[in-house]
Amino acid sequence: APVRSLNCTLRDSQQKSLVMSGPYELKALHLQGQDMEQQVVFSMSFVQGEESNDKIPVALGLKEKNLYLSCVLKDDKPTLQLESVDPKNYPKKKMEKRFVFNKIEINNKLEFESAQFPNWYISTSQAENMPVFLGGTKGGQDITDFTMQFVSS
């Protein structure tokens, strides 16, 4: 059966939008007006994952692109990347663990914890125009809270 997906955009808790920065990287910056059209639209897929009270397993693909956010070890450090996949096979219900994020939602604020690397979160920097990355700290300088906006399919 096909996996269920919804299109959305994400902004960090400082209202920075996410845009492409080269072919395989996202960056976060403040956008206004017509520039908002630059922000990436995600296809959030609701996938299978480990049972947990407050965590919903999702995969985050870029809409109409065969790119998914994934978490891998690079130089022994959990790292966020955009990974190219075969569009004939993705998305699917049973995504490989590197593609799975545990969506944690409290009062419409979302966090995305890596299923592959627990306690590592999709993060942005306080500074403008910096890459979106996988961070190992919550509640520090780096931002791990996002809001989601639906986009018509």
Partner: antibody, heavy 120, light 107 residues
């Protein structure tokens, strides 16, 4: 409080259409699917379709495709289900229910139901 | 379509009894299973979501368990207000489908 309030009972002629409304209050209408389910007298429950007001996404039960139209008006937090080409076997109680956008909470809240009677 | 086979279709029990209702899906439905209660002439009331999560305000005598294709609703100690019909529903795959219901009657 959090509730779904449906429109009143309807009596319709075969071949006509009916439009049932479901007004949501007490929660963020955009973020929940509105589900439509019917229950014929003495029968089980049958899912008809759903709409996510925030995105406009709609999914229908193939069985009703072409006969059912589901819409939502965000300005009034109201969802609608219209069923056309009515026949006697469409006599049923029609329920709306809500489900969170990520499907986590199941059919978490139900409307009180709307009885639609199809009779010549 | 996924078939949801609920059993028994009816049962008689006394106040204080432990009651178990089962629901079998024709294929794996992951975690997307709910249970709800319906009394005659009333709207359904949600009890359990995601197989085993209790809806806020539902008494702890209700519990859900299972995985994959086999699921159970248990009422640990039946109360007078629990006499009703119980349904399972899968919302893993379109079209969402319901069990046939289990009517819990007073013995």
């Amino acid at each position: 409080q959090v509730q779904l309030v449906q429109s009143g009972a309807e009596v319709k002629k075969p071949g006509s259409s009916v439009k049932v409304s479901c007004k949501a209050s007490g929660y963020t209408f955009d973020r929940y699917w509105i589900e439509w389910v019917r229950q014929a007298p003495g029968q089980g429950l049958e899912w008809m379709g759903e709409i996510l007001p925030g995105s406009g996404d709609i999914n229908y039960n193939e069985k009703f495709k072409g006969r059912v139209t589901i819409t939502a008006d965000k300005s009034t937090s109201t969802a609608y289900m219209e069923l056309s080409s009515l026949r006697s076997e469409d006599t049923a109680v029609y329920y709306c229910a809500r489900m969170y956008y990520d499907y986590d909470q199941g059919f978490s809240l139900w409307g009180q139901g709307t009885l639609v009677t199809v009779s010549s | 379509d996924i078939q949801m086979t609920q059993s028994p279709s009816s049962l008689s029990a006394s106040v204080g009894d432990r009651v178990t209702i089962t629901c079998k899906a024709s294929q794996d439905i992951d975690r997307f299973l709910s249970w709800f209660q319906q009394k005659p002439g009333k709207a359904p009331k949600s009890l359990i979501y995601r197989v085993k999560r209790l809806v806020d305000g539902v008494p702890s005598r209700f519990s859900g368990s299972g995985s994959g294709t086999d699921f159970t609703l248990t009422i640990s100690s039946l109360q007078p207000e629990d006499f009703a019909t119980y349904y399972c529903v899968q919302y893993d795959e379109f079209p969402y489908t319901f069990g046939g219901g289990t009517k819990v009657e007073i013995k």
